[in-house]
């Protein structure tokens, strides 16, 4: 059985049948007897109890409000009411795109791993019994496919995969021919395998700081979802109260791989935090990676050439 | 789904020592480190020690220094505390619980690694 | 070690009640601060980190504010899956620090 419609919050495309399944559904089968009632709201108009006699366009079957089709002022709120259960819908319905064979705000992106499998299948469970034929559109063409009533792509994906696929099934329904439309925007990336993990930056830095003063260290780089970025500094990280480690940021970049950031914070810097190495380090399966900074008096600058500080 | 399963309830005499394990499953267990919290009958939460899963690294309480041993063994994926001169005061459940000062941002809702994941405590009972 | 101080110790409220927790640290620990709840027999749950953020999959009514050594915890409308005993954590610094409780209990 077709599941029920739990989302609260719902757009759909004019034009298209479309319906709403509650999600009492068995409750409602056991209590035959009992009155259940289909409202809308909209606007100024407070609960209308909706019939078929309402409008042509809609059917009442058991636990579904069907709309034959949607059109752009079925837009509101629309409430099933049971004996003491309630369930309640926001319907957004918006105008279809003229120039296309889709809706642009109607598109489920997917992201596919080049060589890895990618699958498209045409099908619609709860009208499948309606359906006469379903296409498959790749970027608004026809893609020439054996089955016409589930056409299917299942291969490895290459580059030239990428598009908008479009499955739209015809149906009849009262001497009607209509059509529904799914539209999934197929992105091929690179492979996500693992990367090896990279600090970003100088592996050594001198940093100028004044003493009293505090800094901020900034450790970053580009991992995988399972490496770490840590910080080893003194004989026991936590042994000195001005040394602080922060929390990490880590941030998935558009390729699947993760962006992290790491800071070292140290207050009141004193003579014991000059000329000592605080470590970065990011660690994998692969082995490690480390960059090192140095604080340094800013009157020591001198000494050391330029391109080597840090701000 | 992710969880930590601790050992079994202790019943130690005063002097001895306990070792409470702390398996890890449903994530990469030396990604994250792993803290180690107390708590006596009818009392609050006391923090413990931590120890960094991927190289090691401890931070302990500074009234359990010299008594108190976090270690793990990455190959079964368990963290292990040991507490010795056990003492009467010692009684109490011990939790042990994924932390990682890290979060997370993939799609809309971050999520923080920091003590997120709790095991279900192991009782240790100290007395003579 | 840094200590935390936690207000009131215990109150009572009722369903739909707006709850108020403070907890106050000895020194600035910026907004390094976590809530925890814990009911009877079971392990602490994590709510709110960084002060303000709501740990994900934790219901909205939950909210923490403040920073440097002042924070709160709110419960907006109080439920009864709610009454527990909430506890604050610094982690600013190590060792870090539990405040000693609220238990929010049944008026």
């Known amino acids: 059985a077709e599941s029920c419609t739990s989302r609260p919050h719902i757009t759909v495309v004019e034009g298209e049948p479309f319906y709403l399944k509650h999600c009492s559904c068995s409750l409602a089968h056991e209590i035959e007897t009992t009155t259940k009632s289909w409202y809308k709201s909209s606007g100024s108009q407070e609960h209308v109890e909706l019939n078929p006699r309402s409008s042509s366009r809609i059917a009442l079957h058991d636990c579904v409000l069907e709309f034959w089709p949607v059109e752009l002022n079925d837009t509101g709120s629309y409430f099933f009411q049971m004996k003491n259960y309630t369930q309640k819908w926001k319907l957004n319905v918006i105008r279809r795109n003229k120039h296309s064979c889709f809706t642009e705000r109607q598109v489920t992106s997917k992201i596919v791993e080049v060589k890895k499998f990618f699958q498209i299948t045409c099908e619609n469970s709860y009208y499948q019994t309606l359906v006469n034929s379903t296409s498959l559109y790749k970027n608004c063409k026809k893609l020439l496919l054996e089955n016409n009533k589930n056409p299917t792509i299942k291969k490895n994906a290459e580059f030239e995969d990428q598009g908008y696929y479009s499955c739209v099934h015809f149906l009849h329904h009262n001497g009607k021919l209509f059509n529904i439309t799914k539209t999934f925007n197929i992105t091929i990336v690179e492979d996500r395998s693992n990367i090896v993990p990279v600090l970003l930056g100088p592996k050594l830095n001198h940093v100028a700081v004044e003493l009293g003063k505090n800094v901020r260290l900034n450790c970053s780089a580009l991992l995988n979802e399972e490496d770490v970025i840590y910080w080893m500094f003194g004989e026991e990280n936590g042994s000195d109260p001005n040394i602080h480690e922060e929390k990490e940021m880590r941030i998935m970049t558009p390729e699947g791989k993760w962006h992290a950031s790491k800071v070292l914070r140290i207050e009141n810097i004193g003579e014991s935090n000059l000329n000592v190495l605080y470590n970065c380090t990011v660690a994998s399966t692969g082995g490690t990676d480390t960059k090192s900074f140095i604080l340094v008096r800013k009157a020591d600058m001198a000494d050391i050439p330029g391109h080597v500080f840090t701000r | 789904q992710v969880q930590l399963v601790q050992s079994g309830a202790e019943v130690k005499k005063p002097g001895a020592s306990v070792k409470v394990s702390c398996k890890a499953s449903?994530?990469?267990?030396?990604?994250?480190?792993i803290s180690w919290v107390r708590q006596a009958p009818g009392q609050g939460l006391e923090w413990m020690g931590w120890?960094?899963?991927?190289?090691?690294?401890?931070n302990y309480a500074q009234k359990l220094q010299g008594r108190v041993t976090m270690t793990t063994d990455t190959s079964t994926s368990t963290a292990y505390m040991e507490l010795r001169s056990l003492r009467s005061d010692d009684t109490a459940v011990y939790y042990c619980?994924?932390?990682?000062?890290?979060?997370?941002?993939?799609?809309?809702?971050?999520?923080?690694?920091?003590?997120?994941?709790w095991g279900q405590g192991t009782t240790v009972t100290v007395s003579s | 070690a840094i200590q935390m101080t936690q207000s009131p110790s215990s109150l009572s409220a009722s369903v739909g009640d707006r709850v108020t927790i403070t907890c106050r640290a000895s020194?600035?620990?910026?907004?390094?601060l976590g809530w925890f709840q814990q009911k009877p027999g079971k392990a602490p749950k994590l709510l709110i980190y960084?002060?303000?953020s709501l740990q994900s999959g934790v219901p909205s009514r939950f909210s923490g504010s403040g920073s440097g050594t002042d924070f709160t915890l709110t419960i907006s409308s109080l439920q009864p899956e709610d009454f527990a005993t909430y506890y604050c954590?610094?982690?600013?610094?190590?060792?870090?620090?539990f405040g000693q409780g609220t238990k929010v209990e049944i008026k």
């Open positions: 020194q600035d620990i910026r907004n390094d």
């Open positions: 449903g994530y990469t267990f030396n990604s994250y480190g």
């Open positions: 619980a994924r932390d990682e000062a890290r979060i997370v941002v993939a799609g809309t809702t971050p999520y923080y690694y920091g003590m997120d994941v």
């Open positions: 954590l610094q982690d600013y610094n190590y060792p870090r620090t």
């Open positions: 960084a002060a303000s």
């Open positions: 120890i960094r899963t991927y190289n090691g690294n401890t």
